[in-house]
Interface confidence: medium
């Protein structure tokens, strides 16, 4: 059989072959970061010759060339330095404005290894127009310099650069430009996952969020759409399984889609998910018309059942047909619900297209997009009802122009991306949905992305302190109530002197609240068993604080979910008739349950809660603690069944000042408080002035470290008595 020659090495890089040296095999070059391959690929033709795509000649020796970033073509009302034809990776460009103009955006930008500039477009603006000066991104040329209501500006890119974003923008009545900022990029450039996740996530959480659309802050540029709890979202996942997608990459497409589905169902909104795989023809694996499209297990199951081999007979990339099948699905649903009904008109639609290349058959996918926009009646007023995300994976044959044409264009948002590989895609989907943008009191939502602050990761976490030093920690369980430990209040009851420090996005120090009332468990008495030789006893170590004002929900302040409540039931996605026992069985379902608490410095530390037989062996070392319990005969006199036990294996131990803080678990991307830090046999912060320092117990310590946490499942009567009007409790 014919095979292609093997003299295809690339100097300074590597290559992979899709099907060895046989005809039909695709050779893909790759280079170290900061370099790009030229040519990017070759195809082994049936004649046994390598064909190099497009402009490059087949005989060209493959080389790794340095990535460069585009230079500014023009910069209005200011100057930039240095003035180069293009800029090397790591190179900077600086901007300054003429007198009377204020610089908006980044004064200094650096060329990154992916051929993209960091920061934001620099604009010198005097604030004269109805809309702000839209600026000119690096490498672009703008025509139109009037910024009044109805004025239009047009953009094109200098030679060899590709425009993404809107080529034309209009100044709207609300003082905002239509569409999205145009960016000129090198054809070989791609996006880093850490840029895509927040951009995609911001846009997506706007669709799921519930905030005031007029509030535009730096960290969440763009509109935020109201999806009421009664609202509905149709999510259409389109997965490319054409020949150029390897089977392994298709698996990662599926995995990424699963992550997306899992995350989307963790919002308390009504969602239907369609799954369509496509090559030459689309295959609908789940339709939004199917009642199962609302059931996460069914959706995940149909994703898992998606087979790479489903498309082995037709291996082209027919993006038009895939989008057209979405259109047909919409059309069927519209007929079913009635075009004029609210039920149809209030559905929001999001399409996520995962592809590795450009469509090469079936006509222009743009036609299908136009049909979709038409059927959904997408106009300026209804722009929020459709979002199309076009994500290209693998720099090889992805067509920037096509992706850009398909992706939605909304101010301050991006909907078209190219990622280097499927690994990067997986990273994006892992971190994209930042549910913490929600402002209602949805519980147990923490920002899990890598760049989130400690307080954003655990926004329920509060510090309780008297006027002097910090003493205890606690957890928000609603917008006005904090759950903590009773022993924090054993030295004096004048709560007017106390403050509760709650996370606040505007201040790294948080915001202080006064306490309206403290409800301390009447059963708590540290000296209750002194006459039995038990110097300290922490039974009923639980307290509630009502804050003087309600806390404004934000990325930094949000309640944790308390088990045995309707709120937690929704977050666990359990059926309506669930009981408190069901929650306990789901959350504390193993002999050793991984859990967390928050350290003095705000970081999340790991412990393992011991259950059943392991609880007994975890607790029994207390008998070796001769200082606190000099003549203890029965461990259960000290460690009652009110306590959870941790401190074995590689567990961290809480420090004295961490008492009252939540002991919590993560399930389905939501957080649930099962206990609160009460007491322990070892203080890892003893003698350490540094908040970041904790010394593990020496391996020879007797007794070994053990930590005991009030088990909230054992405190239900008391919690219900005091929080019955605040939370909706399930039957026991």
């Amino acid at each position: 059989a014919t095979s292609c020659p093997q003299n295809v090495n690339i100097s300074g890089g590597t290559f992979t072959l899709s099907h060895g040296w046989a005809p039909g095999s695709l050779l893909i070059y790759s280079c170290p970061q900061g370099l790009y391959p030229s040519p990017a690929s070759r195809l082994c033709k049936s004649s046994g010759q390598w064909q190099t795509p497009r402009a490059t000649r087949s005989l060209t020796k493959a080389v790794c060339k340095p990535v460069r970033c585009p230079a500014p073509v023009s910069f209005e009302n200011g100057i930039y330095t240095p003035r180069l034809g293009s800029y090397p990776v790591g190179g900077n460009v600086s901007f300054e404005c003429e007198d009377g103009f204020i610089l908006r955006g980044s004064p200094v930008r650096q060329c990154r290894p992916n051929g993209m500039w960091d920061g934001e477009t620099a604009v010198c603006d005097n604030g004269a127009g109805h809309c702000p000066n839209p600026g000119i991104s690096l490498g672009a040329v703008r025509t139109g310099s009037r910024f009044g209501h109805g004025d239009k500006v047009r953009y094109r890119c200098s030679s060899n650069l590709v425009l993404t974003g809107s080529a034309e923008r209009e100044c709207q009545g609300n003082g905002v430009w239509s569409g999205t900022e145009p960016i000129c990029r090198q054809p070989y450039s791609y996006d880093f996952p850490e840029d895509v996740a927040p951009a995609l996530g911001t846009s997506f959480s706007h669709m799921l969020g519930a905030t005031n659309p007029t509030q535009r802050t730096k960290e969440s540029l763009g509109r935020k759409i109201q999806i009421q709890r009664s609202g509905h979202l149709n999510l259409y996942l389109l997965l490319d399984s054409s020949q150029s997608v390897s089977e392994n990459d298709f698996l990662i497409f599926k995995e990424s889609a699963s992550l997306m589905v899992d995350r989307i169902f963790s919002f308390e909104i009504n969602v239907s998910v369609a799954i369509i795989t496509f090559a030459s023809e689309p295959k609908v694996l789940m339709s939004v018309l199917n009642v199962n499209s609302r059931d996460i297990t069914e959706v995940i199951s149909s994703l898992e059942n998606a087979k790479y081999k489903d498309h082995e007979n037709g291996t082209g990339t027919n993006t038009y047909a895939a989008l057209n099948s979405v259109y047909l699905m919409m059309n069927n649903q519209m007929q079913l619900l009635g075009m004029k009904t609210m039920a149809w008109q209030e559905i929001r639609h999001a399409i996520i297209l995962l592809t590795d290349g450009k469509s090469n058959m079936g006509g222009s996918p743009k036609t299908a997009v136009d049909q979709i926009r038409e059927i959904l009646n997408i106009n300026q007023k209804r722009n929020d009802y459709l979002d199309i995300y076009a994500i290209g994976v693998g720099k090889l044959d992805v067509d920037w122009r096509e992706l850009n044409e398909l992706g939605s264009k909304k101010d301050g948002e991006r909907h078209a991306f190219i990622l280097q590989d499927t690994k990067a895609l997986h990273q994006v989907f892992e971190h994209m949905l930042d549910v913490s943008k929600l402002t209602d009191t949805i519980c147990g939502v923490g920002n899990m992305s890598a760049n989130a602050s400690d307080q954003e990761r655990t926004p329920w976490h509060v510090t309780i302190k008297p006027k002097s030093q910090e003493t205890c920690r606690g957890a928000l369980i609603s917008d006005q109530w904090v759950l903590t430990a009773a022993h924090c209040f054993r030295d004096g009851n004048d709560h007017s002197l106390w403050r509760v420090n709650v996370g606040d996005p505007k201040s790294q120090w948080g915001k202080e609240f006064l306490i309206e009332k403290a409800v301390i468990s009447p059963g708590f008495d540290v000296f209750a068993k002194k006459n039995q030789g038990i110097l300290e006893f922490y039974g009923d170590d639980i307290a509630l604080l009502k804050l003087a004002q309600k806390v404004k929900m934000s990325t930094h302040a949000r309640p944790i979910c308390l088990p045995c409540t309707m709120e937690a039931n929704l977050a666990l996605r359990r059926p309506q008739g669930s009981t408190c026992r069901d929650h306990e069985n789901e959350l504390l379902n193993k002999q050793s349950v991984p859990a967390h608490f928050v350290a003095l410095n705000g970081s999340k530390l790991n412990i393992n809660l011991k259950m059943g037989v392991e609880w007994t062996s975890c607790a029994e070392v207390v008998s070796q603690e001769k200082t606190m319990f000099p003549n203890l005969t029965d461990v259960r006199e000290v460690v009652t069944d009110q306590f959870l036990c941790s401190g074995t294996q590689e567990d961290e131990s809480p420090c004295k000042g961490e008492s009252g803080g939540a002991v919590f678990l993560e399930r389905r991307f939501r957080f649930f408080q099962v206990g609160l830090v009460s007491w322990g046999l070892y203080n890892p912060c003893l003698g350490s002035a540094d908040k970041n320092s904790r010394k593990r117990a020496p391996r020879s310590k007797v007794p070994p470290p053990r930590d005991f946490h009030i088990n909230l499942f054992r405190m239900q009567p008391w919690l219900r008595q005091h929080l019955g009007d605040v939370l909706n409790f399930l039957p026991l």
Epitope: D690, K695, P698, R699, S700, V702
Partner: antibody
């Protein structure tokens, strides 16, 4: 004052076993782990393993697992290390060392020279 | 196992001069906010003696010309002004997890 006193020098034939003792005084024996470290002439230090006298739990360097056995007699505050199937390369000074609160070896015995020779 | 590599293997320093010994670990020895790296001095015919614990803490009774620094995988023992009695072999040792390991030792001589 903390003191660790080890047993005297031993000469053994290849294939035999040796048991070195380490008597502790000046602190509560069960409060700290006891470690065993050896040093061949002109060579560096090599950790053999440790024992928690309270629980009699042990941790071994894989290299010695199966050949080294560490035990304690709490009533006389003494730790023991037995090494079996001796070979000539086991000729070394064997030290017991007491761990402190930082898992460092704060106190050392004077050492026991074990010579393996046919 | 965590391999500790000391450098140099030996060095000669004049009295009153500064001596610096490095120890590099193949894996981080940091946990719970502390670096579980310790330094010992050993003179011929004697057992080792603990000088520095947890990377930078001077054991009581040890002269303050000895100091330790470093974090994660790279550590340094410094003798600020060398005295005659400091001629010895110095070892680093980690106790981050089992098995504990020692560096190969650095022999310090007076020039």
């Amino acid at each position: 004052e903390v003191q660790l006193v080890q047993s005297g020098a031993e000469v053994k034939k290849p294939g035999a076993s040796v048991k070195v003792s380490c008597k502790a005084s000046g602190y509560t024996f069960t409060d700290y782990n006891m470690d065993w470290v050896r040093q061949a002439t002109g060579q560096g230090l090599e950790w053999i393993g440790d024992i928690n006298p309270n629980y009699e739990s042990t941790g071994y360097n894989q290299k010695f697992k199966g050949r080294a056995t560490m035990t304690v007699n709490k009533s006389i505050s003494t730790a023991y290390m037995e090494l079996s199937s001796l070979r000539s390369e086991d000729t070394a000074v064997y030290y017991c060392a007491r761990e402190d609160d930082h898992d460092a070896f704060a106190y050392w015995g004077q050492g026991t020279l074990v010579t393996v020779s046919s | 196992d965590n391999v500790l590599t000391q450098s140099p293997d030996s060095l000669a320093v004049s009295l009153g001069e500064r001596a610096t010994i490095s120890c590099r670990a193949s894996k981080s020895v940091r946990t719970s906010g502390y670096n579980y790296m310790h330094w010992y001095q050993q003179k011929p015919g004697q057992p080792p003696k603990l000088l520095i614990y947890l990377a930078s803490n001077l054991k009581s009774g040890v002269p303050d010309r000895f100091s330790g620094s470093g974090s994660g995988t790279d550590f340094t023992l410094t003798i600020s002004s060398l005295q005659a009695e400091d001629a010895a072999t110095y070892y680093c040792q980690h106790s981050r997890e089992l098995p504990y390991t020692f560096g190969q030792g650095t022999k310090l001589e007076i020039k």
